[in-house]
């Protein structure tokens, strides 16, 4: 008899896009409409929740912009929280200082991406220093991962 | 009898590098010489053509530089075109404004990378706002993808 | 009789983080403590040594910062060395010029990431132009790869 058909495992992947009703940290994300992907990973209150231990490539881009530059320090972090650990672990971070001409309209992006060994129940979040300076267009600000 | 040898499927992957004879949008790319990769994906008139539906990590870097900074707004987009849809879809985008000191020699890169669900016959392209300010060195300006 | 259990091949992956005792080029990396990964790839004197030919996604981020901006040109390169070839091959590179306001405290990151066809015994390194301006926090400066 022929062997049973191979069960193709669903790829664990997420691509979430900017959501302009973020009011506080961590950033919240669009998980339903547009060019969003969410498969084999859960989204909960701004976080991507890992449900299978393994290696993941995690990435995020944030688009900062303002009408009148005053060079406020900008930071963009991807961090991990797990109930087993008391403290957040910053996985990747980008900082910018002195990046535009005082008084001018300005725009700048921060991109982060790397491989991590994640454990089931890890929660991943994105934090920025100046929420009011983030533009949430889906092509400009996003957060994602995939299991290798 | 032993089973037939497993047919190893070719990985769908592309890494194209800057081509300085780009005269208009979308950018054109070197698809033959140097550190170029093109396997299981076609290159046509600036675009990467998908021939198998699935999840892809898509990335691009563009290196902008100039001799006398005027702070013209810079944009770098990866977009998708498919004959089924009337309009281009901007998948990822980076913008820069007020990024250098007036009159000075300057240089800056924009990097984009994320996961998308692409469909057979999708065409992916890269667009920039100021073609004359792009440097096309193969290590500096590139466009690629791979199927997860 | 049931077939022998499938031997799950170890994923070839690395994620190395900044090491502040780097004194010269290429940069040296933390390969043991913290959020480091090293599996199926060797680390030797600043380099990641490939031991299996194939397609790899290679990435690096470097965080530059200083107390008083004088706009020294910054460069960040990922390059490859192989005993078969006389010269280093620059795979990816980022350059920055005129990126901050003279005299001010400043901070900026460079991110690189792309797919390459690597050969067994290739050594991959990271080079920067201004070592004294690099901050080596593990979340800010890193170097990694994984086999597709």
């Amino acid at each position: 008899p022929s062997p049973p058909p191979e069960k193709k495992e669903l790829r664990k992947v997420a691509h979430l896009t900017g959501k302009s009703n973020s009011r506080s940290m961590p950033l919240e994300w669009e998980d339903t409409y547009g060019i969003v992907l969410l498969s084999g990973v859960k989204y909960k209150k701004g976080g991507l929740v890992i449900n299978e231990t393994g290696l993941y490539f995690v990435y995020s881009k944030v688009y900062f912009r303002g009408q009148s530059c005053n060079n406020l320090p900008l930071s963009h972090k991807v961090y991990m929280r797990n109930s087993k650990y008391p403290q957040d672990l910053v996985m990747m971070e980008g900082k910018m200082m002195s990046y535009c001409t005082t008084g001018q309209m300005w725009a700048r992006s921060s991109y982060l991406g790397a491989v991590f060994n994640l454990t089931s129940a890890d929660h991943l979040y994105v934090n920025v220093s100046e929420l009011s300076l983030v533009n949430f267009e889906e092509s400009q600000t996003f957060f994602g991962l995939y299991k290798l | 009898p032993s089973p037939p040898p497993e047919k190893k499927e070719l990985r769908k992957v592309a890494h194209l590098t800057g081509k300085s004879n780009s005269r208009s949008m979308p950018l054109e790319w070197e698809d033959t010489y140097g550190i170029v990769l093109l396997s299981g994906v076609k290159y046509k008139k600036g675009g990467l053509v998908i021939n198998e539906t699935g999840l892809y990590f898509v990335y691009s870097k563009v290196y902008f530089r100039g001799q006398s900074c005027n702070n013209l707004p810079l944009s770098h987009k990866v977009y998708m075109r498919n004959s089924k849809y009337p309009q281009d879809l901007v998948m990822m985008e980076g913008k820069m404004m007020s990024y250098c000191t007036t009159g000075q020699m300057w240089a800056r890169s924009s990097y984009l990378g994320a996961v998308f669900n692409l469909t057979s016959a999708d065409h992916l392209y890269v667009n920039v706002s100021e073609l004359s300010l792009v440097n096309f060195e193969e290590s500096q300006t590139f466009f690629g993808l791979y199927k997860l | 009789p049931s077939p022998p259990p499938e031997k799950k091949e170890l994923r070839k992956v690395a994620h190395l983080t900044g090491k502040s005792n780097s004194r010269s080029m290429p940069l040296e990396w933390e390969d043991t403590y913290g959020i480091v990964l090293l599996s199926g790839v060797k680390y030797k004197k600043g380099g990641l040594v490939i031991n299996e030919t194939g397609l790899y996604f290679v990435y690096s981020k470097v965080y530059f910062r200083g107390q008083s901006c004088n706009n020294l040109p910054l460069s960040h390169k990922v390059y490859m060395r192989n005993s078969k070839y006389p010269q280093d091959l620059v795979m990816m590179e980022g350059k920055m010029m005129s990126y901050c306001t003279t005299g001010q405290m400043w901070a900026r990151s460079s991110y690189l990431g792309a797919v390459f066809n690597l050969t067994s015994a290739d050594h991959l390194y990271v080079n920067v132009s201004e070592l004294s301006l690099v901050n080596f926090e593990e979340s800010q400066t890193f170097f990694g790869l994984y086999k597709l």
Epitope: Q104, M105 | Q67, N70, L72, T102, S132 | -
Partner: antibody, heavy 119, light 111 residues
Framework: EVQLQQSGAELVRPGVSVKISCKGS????????MHWVKQSHAKSLEWIGV????????RYNQKFKGKATMTVDKSSSTAYMELARLTSEDSAIYYC????????????WGQGTSVTVSS | DIVLTQSPASLAVSLGQRATISCKAS??????????MNWYQQKPGQPPKLLIY???NLESGIPARFSGSGSGTDFTLNIHPVEEEDAATYYC?????????FGGGTKLEIK
């Protein structure tokens, strides 16, 4: 045809100010920075400064800080330079010159504006 | 600031011969494989006109008898064969960093 048309010659008394103009035509004005250069018998050619025609931000040669003020009016594709508290040392021909950001040099120059300071 | 020293201050060359003008910079004007040195020609009552950019590149519309060479701190403008209309003052100028500076000029006379 690319042209940088400068305002006419000025004869002014010491201590006053003068504002000279440079109107660009035949190209996209905001794509090029505008530089100003002084030419006097004593000092040959001296770079005064540069202004971003796109965002209006200017950079000056230390020597001309407080002396020269550069501005732009994008709507009329015109760059201006005001020279303050004029002395006989400021008597010279002043040129505007555009600089393509993607190139290496000032490729087109205005015809020059002669400023003579005399009591 | 980078100081540019031109020599000679003036020279007279016979029609059809070679004119050579030197420009020395107080520090290198090279960066990343390029030399940021330019040459201009100025005739009386006219603005400077760009001849050579990035040390050796001929500006569009400039006759091929003009050529530039050099790197680092030492640069040369050559005109060969010299023609009547080449009588003018020639200036070198760097664009490596702000402030840009010019050489003192070389006045070319045709004999």
């Amino acid at each position: 045809e690319v042209q940088l048309q400068q305002s006419g010659a000025e004869l002014v008394r010491p201590g006053v100010s003068v504002k000279i103009s440079c109107k660009g035509s035949g190209y996209t004005f905001t794509d090029y920075t505008m530089h100003w250069v002084k030419q006097s018998h004593a000092k040959s050619l001296e770079w005064i400064g540069v202004i971003s025609t796109y965002q209006g931000d200017a950079r000056y040669n230390q020597k001309f800080k407080g002396k020269a003020t550069m501005t732009v009016d994008k709507s009329s594709s015109t760059a201006y330079m005001e020279l303050a508290r004029l002395t006989s040392e400021d008597s010279a021909i002043y040129y505007c010159a555009r600089f393509p950001d993607w190139d290496y040099a000032m490729d087109y120059w205005g015809q020059g504006t002669s400023v003579t300071v005399s009591s | 600031d980078i100081v540019l020293t031109q020599s000679p201050a003036s020279l007279a060359v016979s029609l059809g011969q070679r004119a050579t003008i030197s420009c020395k910079a107080s520090q290198s004007v090279d960066y990343d494989g390029d030399s940021y040195m330019n040459w201009y020609q100025q005739k009386p009552g006219q603005p400077p006109k760009l001849l050579i950019y990035a040390a050796s590149n001929l500006e569009s519309g400039i006759p091929a008898r003009f050529s530039g060479s050099g790197s680092g701190t030492d640069f040369t403008l050559n005109i060969h064969p010299v023609e009547e209309e080449d009588a003018a003052t020639y200036y070198c100028q760097h664009s490596r960093e702000l402030p840009y500076t010019f050489g003192g000029g070389t006045k070319l006379e045709i004999k």
